[in-house]
């Protein structure tokens, strides 16, 4: 049967992103719509066809734009995503013979890690702590010299979608871990990244 | 020239089942819809369905309940509809046509289907 | 499914007249209307997609317009080849209905 071919995307806060559907048929459909997937119903967008061209929906006029004009290859271009655009997305081609043919194209939106990693000296043990914020939520791992080091880890969800983790090392002998490298380790979205410190004596 | 030739008129008995082809040429197959109508004496045009010749996917009219099947032959360019459990009442014309979207440009010549004991 | 009556069923007219044929269809069905003529044992013949648009190789003299449920086909100027069965389709819907015809007749 007659199908359309969708790709998911996953975009960075705060920039362009666009999503593609391209029906696999002989022929062109008669109009494009594309509507964003609710609880209760799809909402309207932007419609595409040769007769009106294209007619985005005023709740969309400055965020979107139909960025390829096809009847057959449709793309809708979002100019600067924001958290509330992230969602599923339904293109229905309009087509003569075989009606109304959809494909789904999904929106992720995520936020780079902000990490920040910092130590302090209390009188007989030293608190070494890694902070890292984003969106999907980042895992924080601990590279030590040595074994047996105990850590915890707080993890806060914020207003704006983003969730920190936060993870402290114990470290029970600082005079040990002078001078020796320690690696905060924050897995986001399948890339780790290291962050490394020195302890000094203060 | 672009042509759609139909295969001859048939007469048929209640009960039996036809199958009419319609031999594109003069285009490439594959970039039109074929879709049949047919015409009982004296009566409107009835549309039967259609089939994207590219992919093979059809559409039918809910009407004649599975009666009828499209196919098509890409390698001879040559749709075929076929209508089973034939009635007095399928006595008709039966038309192919070609179109892009909804464009339709060229039709065949027209069979006539009897059916009758 | 969706009834397309048309109307008049025939009219008679004559060589050089305007005539108008109206199609109304029992529900909204946008823009997504064809007109098509018919002689006496012979194929249909396009003339009008999508409500308004000339297949090539029709004369001007025929126009279609209309959108939603109300249609019309109009020809400025009978010539004496129009004398046919003219018939409308919808195909916003499955199954795509025709009207039931109008019979254009030489007065």
């Known amino acids: 049967q007659v199908q359309v071919v969708t790709q998911d995307e996953r975009e960075q806060l705060y920039t362009p992103a666009s999503l593609k559907c391209s029906l696999q048929n002989a022929q062109e459909a008669l109009i494009v719509t594309w509507q964003k997937k609710k609880a209760v119903s799809p909402e309207n967008m932007v419609t595409f066809s040769e007769n009106h061209g294209v007619v985005i929906q005023p709740a969309y006029k400055d965020k979107i734009n139909i960025t390829q004009l096809g009847l057959q290859n449709s793309t809708i271009t979002f100019w600067n995503i924001t958290l509330e655009d992230e969602g599923c997305y339904m293109c229905l081609f309009n087509t003569f013979g075989f009606g109304k043919i959809s494909g789904t194209a999904c929106l992720t939106v995520y936020v780079q890690p902000i990490v920040s990693l910092h130590y302090k000296f209390s009188e007989d043990h030293l608190n070494i702590t890694c902070s890292a914020t984003a969106r999907p939520a980042p895992m924080v791992f601990w590279k030590v010299p040595r074994s047996g080091i105990e850590n915890s880890t707080v993890t806060l969800s914020h207003p704006n979608g983003t969730t920190s983790v936060t993870s402290i090392l114990h470290i029970k002998d600082p005079k040990n871990q002078v001078g020796k490298e320690v690696i905060c380790q924050v897995l986001h979205l399948g890339t780790v990244t290291d962050f490394k410190q020195t302890v000094n004596k203060g | 020239q672009v042509q759609l030739v139909q295969s001859g008129a048939e007469v048929k008995k209640p009960g039996a089942s036809v199958k009419v082809s319609c031999k594109a040429s003069?285009?490439?197959?594959?970039?039109?819809?074929i879709l049949w109508v047919r015409q009982a004496p004296g009566q409107r045009l009835e549309w039967m369905g259609h089939?994207?010749?590219?992919?093979?996917?059809?559409n039918y009219n809910l009407k004649f309940k599975g009666r009828v099947t499209i196919t098509r032959d890409t390698s001879a360019s040559t749709a075929y509809m076929e209508l089973s459990s034939l009635r007095s009442e399928d006595t008709a014309v039966y038309y192919c046509?070609?179109?892009?979207?909804?464009?339709?440009?060229?039709w065949g010549q027209g069979t006539l289907v009897t059916v009758s004991s | 499914d969706i009834q397309m009556t048309q109307s008049p069923s025939s009219l008679s007219a004559s060589v050089g007249d305007r005539v108008t044929i109206t199609c109304k269809a029992s529900?909204?069905?946008?823009?997504?209307l064809s007109w098509f003529q018919q002689k006496p044992g012979k194929a249909p013949k396009s003339l009008i997609y999508?409500?308004?648009r000339l297949v090539d190789g029709v004369p001007s003299r025929f126009s279609g317009s209309g959108s939603g449920t109300d249609f019309s086909l109009t020809i400025s100027s009978l010539q004496p080849e129009d004398f046919a069965t003219y018939y409308c389709?919808?195909?916003?819907?499955?199954?795509?209905?025709f009207g039931q015809g109008t019979k254009l007749e030489i007065k």
């Open positions: 046509a070609r179109s892009k979207r909804d464009y339709f440009d060229y």
């Open positions: 003069g285009y490439s197959f594959t970039d039109y819809i």
């Open positions: 089939i994207d010749p590219y992919y093979g996917s059809s």
């Open positions: 529900q909204d069905i946008n823009s997504y």
């Open positions: 999508r409500a308004n």
């Open positions: 389709l919808q195909y916003d819907e499955f199954p795509y209905t």
